[in-house]
């Protein structure tokens, strides 16, 4: 048993490097120590991320990919370990780091928020749906007036630069819009957003943020909402939102507002139709919204309400198409 052998020495890995391989993504790489005796034994490596956020894990590989914001730099250590059922032997640590990019913290953007929507694909024969992305941010409090910001996103191996910006009064980019992206809102991979900047007066600090596509996906409103009145009953029906998810993946919330007495009836539904009793003297406003439900993914936020449809007194039946 090597672990019980007094003279057995575990040597640290060599050539430990950290390389940025994409937006908010680094590759840690090292080699086994060439001077290690008993190379045939089952060596593992213990990786410790020191910054920006502490984490540790074991691996048998000699490389490891990390997805993390890099605007504050990145530091990690690795050591060789040998495990047995009752003890673990470890070498000394070797460390490496990526320096934080230049720029004072107050120059980078703040309050970065992003949302995605499902849209009809421009290549419907290949893929019927794509995802749009909209991000907004605030200008850094210490950013000079001539600062200009530029946004990029990465999803998987694909990176895109923003081409459509909204600007503030000083002509600085404060929002970005991608009509169609490579993002898959059904996936579990993280979306990396990177905003860097330039100014003649100061170095602008970049900013990275990771988003879960599930968490930022804004469900479209239900489509083709129809309302009929028949002998004191409202028959309400709609189609699922524009989405790559099938019908059974949606829950709905229906809001029936009696404009005469101000009463609001709210119903949570799994079906795309509902019947409600009404009086014959009021006008009603009907709206529906959707959320992706648990059979298909982690339940998401409620989407946007459909446009109101008004029915009732003097408005026998209205259909709203959108």
């Amino acid at each position: 048993d090597l672990l019980n052998h007094k003279k057995f020495l575990l040597l640290p890995p060599v050539n430990f490097t950290i390389k940025a391989t994409g937006l908010a993504q680094v590759l840690l790489h090292w080699d086994p120590n060439p001077d290690q005796e008993q190379r045939h034994v089952d060596l593992e490596y213990h990786v410790k991320i020191n910054a920006p956020q502490e984490d540790e894990y074991d691996t048998r590989k000699t490389e490891s990919k990390c997805v993390t914001p890099l605007h504050e730099g990145f530091a990690a250590s690795v050591r060789t370990i040998l495990k047995s059922s009752h003890t673990t032997l470890a070498s000394s640590w070797v460390s490496a780091e990526l320096k934080a990019p230049p720029g004072s913290p107050g120059t980078s953007v703040t309050n970065l928020t992003c949302t995605t929507h499902t849209v009809v694909s421009s290549h419907t024969h290949l893929r019927p749906y794509q995802v749009s992305l909209r991000c907004t941010w605030l200008v850094g409090k210490d950013a000079p007036e001539d600062t200009q910001y530029f946004l990029y996103y990465r999803f998987g191996v694909l990176t895109e630069k923003c081409q459509e910006y909204s600007r503030d009064a000083l002509n600085r980019n404060t929002a970005c819009w991608f009509p169609r992206t490579f993002i898959n809102s059904k996936g579990f991979e993280q979306l990396a957003v990177h905003i860097n900047g330039s100014s003649k007066r100061a170095a602008i600090k970049p900013f990275d943020q990771l988003f879960s596509p599930l968490a930022i996906d804004q469900v479209n409103p239900p489509r083709n909402v129809t309302v009929e009145i028949e002998s004191n009953s409202l028959y309400i029906q709609w189609e699922k939102p524009l989405s790559a998810f099938p019908d059974h993946c949606f829950n709905y919330e229906l809001k029936i507002y009696n404009t005469k007495n101000g009463h609001i009836q709210k119903e949570k539904l799994i079906a795309n139709k509902f019947i409600s009793k009404i009086d014959d003297v009021s006008t009603y406003s009907i709206q529906v919204r959707a959320a992706v439900s648990s059979p298909c993914r982690m339940p998401g936020r409620w989407g946007e309400w459909s446009q109101p449809i008004y029915v009732g007194k003097e408005r026998k039946s209205l259909v709203e198409w959108h």
Partner: antibody, heavy 124, light 107 residues
Amino acid sequence: EVQLQQSGAELGKPGTSVKLSCKVSGYNIKNTYIHWVNQRPGKGLEWIGRIDPANGNPIYAEKFKNKATLTADTSSNTAYMQLSQLKSDDTAIYFCAMHRGHSMGPGPYVMDAWGQGASVTVSS
Amino acid sequence: DIQMTQSPASLSASLGETVTIECRTSEDIYNGLAWYQQKPGKSPQLLIYNANSLHTGVPSRFSGSGSGTQYSLKINSLQSEDVASYCCQQYSNYPFTFGSGTKLEIK
């Protein structure tokens, strides 16, 4: 209690048509979908299609598009399926089925209430 | 159309045993899967929906699991009244499709 009562057994000659009915009690069919499913002797279940009684819109499985016609009469709370150009391999039991309930449990795409089945025999 | 491959076609087990029936789909159906029980000469009865939700009134010895394209129905502690045919059905895409069925009998 929701009940789906289907019409009786039918004996049809090849080339003719039969019309099966499915009367629902205890639930307004405008609030659900009515599905039709068949089962040939000794075989498994096969989905024929469904109708939305609220607007009369049917959806069919491809192989039944020229065979079955689904309709519904909301005033009598009854769904119908007409089978045309009968052949011997249309001999089967035909079930109507639906989903009941809205705010919990299975969605409207699951069949949790079934008729007793109607036997159709095609023979010359 | 989504193809459903159900196995085995028939199954014989002893009372008190645990049995498992598999259902594979030709594409991801997002858990849009139901399991039905059908006794000879009777209409099918819903057991499981959304791949793993037990329908009201169904004994807890029945359970469903799976995701993506692989699903299964498990019956714990087999009872004599479980003798029946069992089939899966996907409702993720029209046309809805059923598996070919599994006939379960007692040894």
